[in-house]
């Protein structure tokens, strides 16, 4: 290449004038947050205070109730998994704050940001067991006065569980840190390489078993429930069906942009610039279904000042009144017709 | 013209220490950061670390963190390379590259756009 | 640390022939900018390596135009439309994504 007229560049974007300190970021505006990421901080620092202390007022409520009363061991479930999710908040507002600098090592990287999708596992499937209990209670009245045990309902959450740990295994598993040579910067992500069908298949199991497949059929079961109620004109209270489709209803309204733009970015190249707008919106995105986290408590206490009227008790005694409300009464296993129609008048507004 | 003129060829005995130098002219000195590369007879390239001549901020290859140390002498431009603790593994030609420097823009030091014809160090007993 | 794999390893061309050199890294270097720093020096006997292509498909100051380069992510490739004896000699791609930087193995552009 000695014929190559190599002569000192003209780089036209380099100039001579200053000099750049190792840290020194490389362009003038990334010293400042962008807004996505700003907005992201204001939610996480809300889901973290709310979340923190609603779920374990929360915990704290139904744990003592768990051993006699279903709902409860139901509630005490989902808020066991929003307030694991909310420990790891601390850790991702500084990763923000340092402009998505990771110092806190690999295995953080691994389990820290996977809380969130264990999370979204372990309430949708979480939901989905109260959503057949409320089903059952309603359609299935006889079957539950004889089964439906506080045993089972540890069993049915067991089960979720175990499922929602195997869902976040493959996130698990592609989260990588990756160090940066410049700016010098730690990112942690997930990091396919050269499985790009991979990549999508996560994703489209993700939207599909996390999203659609329960928005589907949460529907339709509630749809079913809430025309048995309204048909049979309900007497008694229906708060806890009441909630529960409000909680049901924050998951997929909450999770809906995570989910959108998961599955844009698995199919879009990553250097495209939809891709990279998608990617400066992610924080948000993430941050708006950490608010799941913290919501649940707060219909929780909404329902209880609506179904008080006012806010007249303690917070703890309203939230023991609107969580652990019993759907069946189990004092009598034998059944004469009038027991059967009490019971079907007993569950028909749960 | 930009040049870096490397130190000559040196010998050396397994366990000694040895410090390489690079002398830049032609261009600012402190608007470059200088960068150390290792090349084996018949081998690929390997990154060893870079030198940031302005502030004296460095960062290394774990590979040659504990035995290789950077340095710079802004008055004389020029970069150094001290080695420690040699193995025959370090028989090899040495070279300084530099990279181009942004100035509020989205371009980084990214590349090499400038090398050194090399130093050989042969270690041998 | 990232994995480039350069193949062939061995290249045998006649001049005026088209060539052409794949890398391949064992991660993504799409840097979190969208830029993927890519980068392909010539070597020839008894010389300091030269860059010719950075960022991936920029020809850098001086060097012909029938050297291109393209890729993203993690398959990258390098191509000379008609080889010439002046660009003989070992081609190393090379990446600056990630810490620590690291090199290809090399492709010998010969003769045939």
């Known amino acids: 290449m000695d014929s190559f007229n190599y002569t000192t560049p003209d780089y036209g974007h380099y100039d001579d004038k200053d000099t750049l300190d190792l840290n020194t970021p490389v362009d003038k505006t990334s010293n400042t947050l962008r807004v996505p990421d700003i907005l992201a901080l204001v939610i996480f620092a809300v889901v973290f205070l709310v979340g923190v202390l609603g779920n374990a007022l929360v915990v704290w409520v139904t744990a003592f109730e768990a051993k006699r009363t279903i709902n409860a061991i139901w509630f005490l479930n989902l808020a066991v998994a929003d307030f694991l999710s909310c420990l790891a908040l601390p850790i991702l507002f500084t990763s923000i704050v340092q402009h998505h600098h990771w110092p806190f090592g690999g295995a953080a990287c691994s389990i820290l940001p996977s809380l969130i999708l264990l999370n979204m596992y372990a309430s949708i499937l979480l939901l989905a067991t109260i959503s057949a209990d409320r089903f059952l209670l309603v359609f299935k009245p006889i079957w539950c006065q004889n089964f439906r045990g506080a045993g089972l309902a540890w069993i049915a959450c067991a089960v979720a569980w175990g499922l929602a740990l195997l869902l976040t295994i493959p996130s698990f598993l592609y989260r990588v840190v990756r160090e940066e040579y410049f700016p010098p910067k730690v990112l942690c992500g997930v990091d396919y390489s050269h499985d790009k069908r991979r990549e999508r298949a996560v994703a489209i199991v993700r939207l599909v078993l996390g999203f659609l497949w329960p928005l589907l059929t949460l529907t339709i079961c509630y749809t079913f429930i809430l025309l048995r109620t309204w048909s049979r004109r309900a007497t008694r209270s229906t708060k806890t069906l009441k909630v529960v489709v409000a909680v049901v209803a924050s998951f997929f309204i909450f999770w809906l942009p995570y989910q959108v733009t998961g599955i844009m970015m698995s199919f879009l190249e990553p250097s495209s610039p939809t891709f990279l707008l998608l990617k400066k919106l992610d924080s948000l995105c993430v941050s708006f279904a950490y608010i799941n986290c913290c919501i649940n408590p707060i219909i929780y206490v909404v329902a209880g000042q609506g179904f008080q009227g006012r806010l007249r008790k303690s917070l703890p005694s309203l939230l023991r009144n609107v969580l652990t409300e019993e759907s069946v009464v189990r004092e009598s296993k034998s059944f004469t017709r009038s027991t059967v129609d009490t019971m079907a008048q007993k569950t028909q507004a749960v | 013209q930009v040049q870096l003129q490397q130190s000559g060829a040196e010998l050396a005995k397994p366990g000694a220490s040895v410090k390489l130098s690079c002398k830049a002219s032609?261009?600012?000195?402190?608007?470059?950061?200088m960068h150390w590369v290792k090349q084996r007879p018949g081998q690929g390239l390997e990154w060893i670390g870079y030198i940031n001549p302005s502030s004296a901020s460095s960062k290394y290859n774990q590979k040659f963190k504990d035995r290789a140390t950077l340095t710079t002498d802004k008055s004389s431009s020029t970069a150094f390379m001290h080695l420690s603790s040699l193995t025959y593994e370090d028989s090899a030609v040495y070279y300084c590259?530099?990279?181009?420097?942004?100035?509020?823009?989205?371009?980084?030091?990214?590349?090499?756009?400038?090398w050194g014809q090399g130093t050989t160090l042969t270690v041998s007993s | 640390d990232v994995v480039m794999t350069q193949t062939p390893l061995s290249l045998p061309v006649s001049l005026g022939d088209h060539a052409s050199i794949s890398c391949r890294s064992s991660q993504s270097l799409i840097h979190s900018n969208g830029n993927n720093y890519l980068h392909w020096y010539l070597q020839k006997p008894g010389q300091s390596p030269k860059l010719l292509i950075y960022?991936?498909?920029n020809r850098f100051s001086g060097v012909p135009d029938r050297f291109s380069g393209s890729g993203s992510g993690t398959d990258f490739t390098l191509k000379i439309s008609r080889v010439e004896a002046e660009d003989l000699g070992v081609y190393f791609c090379?990446?600056?994504?990630?810490?620590?930087?690291?090199f290809g193995s090399g492709t010998k552009l010969e003769i045939k």
């Open positions: 960022t991936v498909s």
């Open positions: 590259a530099r990279v181009p420097l942004p100035y509020g823009s989205s371009y980084g030091p990214y590349f090499f756009d400038f």
């Open positions: 090379s990446q600056s994504t990630l810490v620590p930087l690291t």
């Open positions: 032609g261009y600012t000195f402190t608007n470059y950061w």
